[in-house]
Amino acid sequence: MRRERGRQGDSSSCERQVDRVNLKPCEQHIMQRIMGEQEQYDSYDIRSTRSSDQQQRCCDELNEMENTQRCMCEALQQIMENQCDRLQDRQMVQQFKRELMNLPQQCNFRAPQRCDLDVSGGRC
């Protein structure tokens, strides 16, 4: 269940940084914003839950990475990839992408100028 830690390699690389952070609060935060009325998500009840819980932890995790456009984009792509299969239709995919692109701004980070969120072979 727990994270495989201590993978050696260049600790400054975006891949290593994205691998070290916990992106689940970001995923929950976005799902809460687009599915607030839905009963269950990922076995955690999001009814009447303040999104600020997830947002604070999400921003803390994103803050752990070097604040570069490339690393932020890789993190957003990873979030998109992790949640792709849970997004039920095209409209939900678009909503998720919109919220995802707003995430850096919500955390007071620079948003990546160009970040292709089309992942999973075009499914998302």
């Epitope: 830690r5 201590g6 955690y44 932890r57």
Partner: antibody, heavy 123, light 108 residues
Framework: EVQLVESGGGLVQPGGSLRLSCAAS????????MNWVRQAPGKGLEWVSS????????YYADSVKGRFTISRDNAKNSLYLQMNSLRDEDTAVYYC????????????????WGKGTTVTVSS | EIVLTQSPGTLSLSPGERATLSCRAS???????LVWYQQKPGQAPRLLMY???TRATDIPDRFSGSGSGTDFTLTISRLEPEDFAVYYC?????????FGQGTKLEIK
């Protein structure tokens, strides 16, 4: 063996200062957020402060804000708590605790704790 | 600040009985950020449950957690002698990461 060992506690007068240390071993220290939690004699647990892996995000309990400073040295596998302007109510056992998270579902938890170091503030 | 209120303050039961411990939050807490710890006299706290309902490593299945929003519960289905201790809930989603005041589970 995964271990946290606190040191630096002792008797200090009100208004005085103390620096607590926590030595980590048996795991990659720089991969974990760290916390200080205290427990006054006969009382419950009180979260004091937390610091993220790279020290970029730090939080404090309102009761210690402006008086205590948390820091870490990843090269030395050490966590610190600088305590200034100490008050009687800061008397407690201070625990250092490692914070991990479940990679598959995301929740955070403090899974490794030191045995604690005792701080007594008294004139 | 989110205030966590645990009840009862003290619970007196016998081995073999069922224990139900409550933790109520002053504001809604995602169950992703609700943790339970056990502490015995003279010892450091021990992680029991995280994400409200996931047992930590080596925690026996007589321990279970449930709840959402503002109401959370820790249940011990059949008390063993080693279960008598103080139990704390904690929320770690929003700083300050507050603890409840604890429930002391004592032998009747």
């Amino acid at each position: 063996e995964v271990q946290l060992v606190e040191s630096g506690g002792g008797l200090v007068q009100p208004g005085g200062s103390l620096r607590l240390s926590c030595a980590a071993s048996g795991f990659i220290f720089s991969d974990y957020n760290m916390n200080w939690v205290r427990q006054a004699p006969g009382k419950g647990l009180e979260w004091v402060s937390s610091i993220t892996r790279s020290s970029r995000t730090i939080y404090y309990a309102d009761s210690v804000k402006g008086r205590f400073t948390i820091s870490r040295d990843n090269a030395k596998n050490s966590l610190y708590l600088q305590m200034n302007s100490l008050r009687d109510e800061d008397t407690a056992v201070y625990y250092c605790a490692r914070e991990d998270f479940d990679v598959s579902t995301g929740p955070y938890y403090m899974d490794v704790w030191g045995k604690g170091t005792t701080v007594t503030v008294s004139s | 600040e989110i205030v966590l209120t645990q009840s009862p303050g003290t619970l007196s039961l016998s081995p073999g009985e069922r224990a139900t411990l409550s933790c109520r939050a002053s504001q809604s807490v995602s169950n992703m950020f609700l943790v339970w710890y056990q502490q015995k006299p003279g010892q450091a706290p021990r992680l029991l449950m995280y994400g409200a309902s996931t047992r930590a490593t080596d925690i026996p299945d007589r321990f279970s957690g449930s709840g959402s929003g503002t109401d959370f519960t820790l249940t011990i289905s059949r008390l063993e002698p080693e279960d008598f201790a103080v139990y704390y809930c904690q929320q770690n989603g929003n700083s300050p990461y507050t603890f409840g005041q604890g429930t002391k589970l004592e032998i009747k």
